[in-house]
């Protein structure tokens, strides 16, 4: 009588998460009577996967009808595979008894589960930085298997090289995670820029997953200030304008000071947007030139995006002709009281 053999023909089987796996097992003899059981893993801690003798295993079915004794096929289907199902599965023949006696095990079939990585999530710095500074972006993706994965960074379509990537865990696992940090040097033109994290994996059939982040969330372009004056039709008035250029984001508070004293505060509105995504704004004052006694210094002070204020001063220039137009008795504030104190445009 030939010795019973338990044959598991495949050393390994690979399936994609969500699909079914077929694990094949045949025996060369039906003698002696006794059950076949499937286990994941070997040794005392092995996990019972299916017992043809008894039990309820909702995800496991036999390939052939187990009541047909002469088929000698004990192959099983496992449905809805997840990464947690990965491992080596053993088909084991027992002799009926109390307890059942293990007679022979198959060589085992390693089930590897191909699981797609999750959509990459890109997160940027918590605080904005200014051009010429370096900011870090982090990309994370989880739940993939096998471990081999490729991650690339792009800025506006150009591949970046300054990044560091880790895949965890380092050892064998049912699924893996990737985390990559890229360093990006900001420029003044980056308001409209985008960084892309691209993940390629065997499960994606050449169609990589992408996560994006906008540099507009990470950049602060500080404004440049320019203060100048222009004469008005009324000979005793001049327009003093503060031009605030090329700033981002929009949040901006402007204060006019007359010889160091606050005269007017405005919040930026009706901004004009530049092609590069930055903004311009201007604020102006109507100044009564007859009200001067000494030299008047007007200061435009700008607080941008909660940063320390920057300012630009302008010494009011009054021509001899304008001085002549003023009567000797005229006195009062520098800023024309009959006109709005300021304007913007």
């Amino acid at each position: 009588e030939e010795e019973l053999q338990v044959i598991q023909p495949e050393k390994s089987v690979s399936v994609t998460a969500g699909e079914s796996a077929t694990l094949n097992c045949t025996v060369t003899s039906l003698i002696p009577v006794g059950p076949i059981q499937w286990f994941r893993g070997a040794g005392p801690g092995r996990e019972l996967i299916y017992n043809l003798k008894e039990g309820h295993f909702p995800r496991v079915t036999t390939v052939l009808d187990p009541t047909k004794r002469n088929n000698m096929d004990f192959s099983i289907h496992i449905s809805n595979i997840t990464p947690a199902d990965a491992g080596t599965y053993y088909c084991v023949k027992f002799r009926k008894g109390s307890p059942d006696v293990e007679l022979k095990s198959g060589a085992g079939t390693e089930l590897s589960v191909r699981a797609k990585p999750s959509a990459p999530v890109v997160s940027g710095p918590t605080a904005r930085a200014t051009p010429e500074h370096t900011v870090s972006f982090t990309c994370e993706s989880h739940g993939f298997s096998p471990r081999d994965i490729t991650l690339k960074w792009f800025k506006n379509g150009n591949e970046l090289s300054d990044f560091q990537t880790n895949v965890d865990p380092a050892g064998k696992s049912v699924s893996y995670s990737i985390r990559s940090t890229a360093r990006v040097v900001l420029t003044r033109r980056d308001v409209h820029s985008q960084v892309i994290c691209e993940v390629a994996h065997v499960t994606l059939q050449g169609d990589p997953l992408r996560g994006t982040a906008n540099l507009s969330e990470a950049i602060r372009v500080p404004p440049t200030l320019e203060v100048f004056q222009r004469p008005m039709r009324a000979e005793n008035q001049v327009n003093v304008t503060c031009q605030v250029r090329k700033f981002y984001p929009q949040r901006l508070l402007l204060t006019w000071l007359e010889n160091g004293n606050v005269s007017q505060t405005e919040t930026a509105s009706t901004l004009t947007e530049n092609k590069d995504g930055t903004y311009n704004w201007r604020s102006w004052l109507l100044v009564n030139t007859c009200a001067h006694r000494d030299g008047v210094v007007l200061t435009c002070q700008v607080e941008h995006d909660g940063q320390p204020a920057v300012s630009k001063s302008h010494a009011l220039e009054v021509s001899a002709h304008q001085k002549e137009q003023c009567s000797d008795t005229t006195s009062g504030p520098v800023l024309a009281p009959t006109a709005p104190l300021g304007g913007s445009g």
């Epitope: 059950p35 003798k53 008894e54 187990p66 004794r69 009926k96 008894g97 109390s98």
Partner: antibody, heavy 118, light 107 residues
Framework: EVQLVESGGGLVQPGGSLRLSCAAS????????MHWVRQATGKGLEWVSA???????YYTGSVKGRFTISRENAKNSLYLQMNSLRAGDTAVYYC????????????WGQGTMVTVSS | DIQMTQSPSSLSASVGDRVTITCRAS??????LAWFQQKPGKAPKSLIY???SLHSGVPSKFSGSGSGTDFTLTISSLQPEDFATYYC?????????FGQGTKLEIK
């Protein structure tokens, strides 16, 4: 349809012989362990004999040496040769198929009556 | 030989009742225990194998449990066709042996 049909029962004198047959249909008899079970009138069930797929045979103590179980694959039939019959062997004899993995009884014949009496 | 002891030997119950029959083995039989139903003048019918698995076509009102030496058969809601004699059987080793039977009668 899976079916077992016994025949060969009857009245026999003590010390006499009888051969019971069981014709199987709907399955291959040689692929299963097969059994004979008996039941005396008004009594419980008693396992009598079995034959395994390899031809190995088993008997309950009271019939050892007197009964012989066998099968004929070509006829898909099971037999029980009963010799040296005693009054205590009087019973309905059932042919039973053993289940696939563990030999749990699954299919029963309708039974044939054996009466041992002078 | 392994002795199988059933209790009670007889049981009176009404339609709709839930009844439990117990079976004890004289030694550990793992879960190689079967239950059979027999009506007068008929061949036994296989109900349960490996202590708790229902044979094909057996209604789910029948359930079995136990392992080792102590086993039970439960019928959840008795119907007129369930009044019969029930036998347990060990089939872990030869000679296979049956319990003496439990006769379930209408009250």
């Amino acid at each position: 349809e899976v079916q077992l049909v016994e025949s060969g029962g009857g009245l026999v004198q003590p010390g006499g012989s009888l051969r019971l047959s069981c014709a199987a249909s709907g399955f291959t008899l040689s692929s299963y362990d097969m059994h004979w079970v008996r039941q005396a009138t008004g009594k419980g069930l008693e396992w009598v004999s079995a034959i395994g797929t390899a031809g190995d045979t088993y008997y309950t103590g009271s019939v050892k040496g007197r009964f012989t179980i066998s099968r004929e694959n070509a006829k898909n039939s099971l037999y029980l040769q009963m010799n040296s019959l005693r009054a205590g062997d009087t019973a309905v004899y059932y042919c039973v198929r053993g289940g696939v993995w563990d030999d749990a009884f699954d299919i029963w014949g309708q039974g044939t009556m054996v009466t041992v009496s002078s | 030989d392994i002795q199988m002891t059933q209790s009670p030997s007889s049981l009176s119950a009404s339609v709709g009742d839930r009844v439990t029959i117990t079976c004890r083995a004289s030694q550990d039989i793992n879960n190689y225990l079967a239950w059979f139903q027999q009506k007068p003048g008929k061949a036994p019918k296989s109900l349960i194998y490996t202590a708790s698995s229902l044979h094909s076509g057996v209604p789910s009102k029948f359930s079995g449990s136990g392992s080792g030496t102590d086993f039970t058969l439960t019928i959840s809601s008795l119907q007129p066709e369930d009044f019969a004699t029930y036998y347990c059987q060990q089939y872990v080793s030869y000679p296979y042996t049956f319990g003496q039977g439990t006769k379930l009668e209408i009250k």
